[in-house]
């Protein structure tokens, strides 16, 4: 691969990672196959301090973010433990809610409206995070 | 010049395999992720394969999946389609065209010439 | 995958004339949604981008509308060089990225 050393045109660099805002909504799953085309992945939460940075940027608004449970246990798209790692859910979130009527319940992480975590139905347009880190070299992405 | 040059097109028996090449120049290649779009003869645009600047991301089309392989070499700004398997259906002009992504938008903003695949026996 | 239909399938039309192509999209795709215009032995060329945006170097007798499901390309006054096949394209659910069957513009 190719190590990337400085942010891409229109992306944030914050503590050595590059970060692209969406102002526009897809499917978690687009989402997720936009930000790879990128050489990106859907953003992942590792600190309070990256909270605050990305929930600054997205303002009050649902956003998509690269946490999942759509193979059963939540999983972050880069393969970052989620039971030892940071968490920022809503309280009694996740919840795997299927009372929406859309089928299913709720697989996939966003921000809300003040910058907690909830799960909801993947299918929804949300806005999204991309994330990638710099003076990393360029590797695939994992599988969902 | 801003451009893309495709070339590897030719007859080849079905069942066979075909190797096809997408020479880019005029723009930074390892930026941007590149496509393969096939236009069968009198028929319209289909989409056939995605990869990402890196190399480290492929999409394809399900009429296509598990026979066909998209790759690129970055230090040779060059973009590869291999096509194994090929079926009559597969016959078309194969075009190279380079995505942009634009506040969340995607399309294809430059297109190659295209190079023709013909599958007969 | 999301399917796109396009409309009519092929129209005749005269110089000065103002033609309107219609692209709708089997289920809503925003904004992402873009014009492409092709002529005969020549690659696609890029015309309106995000539905209503002209691509640089596109003549703004070219416009584009729309939003959801049904998109709206408009060539205000035809030109002798405006005659060619035209598709609309969707990124909203993507990869795939999926192409309308084409309309043909020719001259009546």
């Known amino acids: 691969g190719s190590e990337r050393t400085c942010c891409p045109v229109n992306w944030v660099e914050h503590e050595r990672s590059c970060y692209w805002f969406s102002r526009s909504g897809k499917a978690w799953a687009d989402a997720d196959n936009y930000c790879r085309l990128e050489d990106a992945h859907l953003v992942v939460v590792t600190s309070w301090e990256e909270q605050k940075f990305v929930q600054h940027h997205i303002g009050p608004v649902n956003t998509w973010m690269g946490l999942h449970d759509q193979n059963g246990p939540w999983k972050w798209v880069d393969g970052t433990d989620y039971e030892t790692g940071f968490k920022n859910w809503r309280p009694e979130q996740p919840d795997d809610w299927y009372g929406h009527g859309l089928g299913g319940g709720e697989d996939c992480a966003h921000f809300t409206d003040d910058g907690r975590w909830n799960d909801d139905v993947c299918q929804r347009p949300y806005r999204w995070v991309c994330e990638t880190e710099l003076d990393k070299a360029s590797q695939e992405p994992p599988l969902l | 010049e801003v451009q893309l040059l495709e070339s590897g097109g030719g007859l080849v028996q079905p069942g066979g395999s075909l190797r096809l090449s997408c020479a880019a120049s005029?723009?930074?290649?390892?930026?941007?992720?590149m496509n393969w779009v096939r236009q069968a003869p009198g028929k319209g645009l289909e989409w056939v394969s995605v990869i990402s600047g890196s190399g480290g991301s492929t999409y394809y089309a399900d009429s296509v999946k598990g026979r066909f392989t998209i790759s690129r070499d970055n230090s040779k700004n060059t973009l590869y389609l291999q096509m194994n398997s090929l079926r009559a259906e597969d016959t078309a002009v194969y075009y190279c065209?380079?995505?942009?992504?634009?506040?969340?938008?995607?399309?294809?903003?430059?297109w190659g010439r295209g190079t023709l695949v013909t599958v007969s026996s | 995958d999301i399917q796109m239909t396009q409309s009519p399938s092929s129209l005749s039309a005269s110089v000065g004339d103002r033609v309107t192509i219609t692209c709708r999209a089997s289920?809503?795709?925003?904004?992402?949604l873009y014009w492409y215009q092709q002529k005969p032995g020549k690659a696609p060329k890029l015309l309106i981008y995000?539905?209503?945006s002209l691509q640089s170097g596109v003549p703004s007798r070219f416009s584009g509308s729309g939003s959801g499901t049904d998109f709206t390309l408009t060539i205000s006054s035809l030109q002798p060089e405006d005659f060619a096949t035209y598709y609309c394209q969707q990124s909203y659910s993507a990869p795939p990225f999926t192409f309308g069957p084409g309309t043909k513009v020719d001259i009546k």
């Open positions: 005029g723009f930074t290649f390892s930026s941007y992720a």
């Open positions: 065209a380079k995505r942009i992504a634009a506040a969340g938008t995607e399309y294809f903003d430059l």
């Open positions: 289920q809503s795709i925003s904004s992402y």
């Open positions: 995000a539905a209503s």
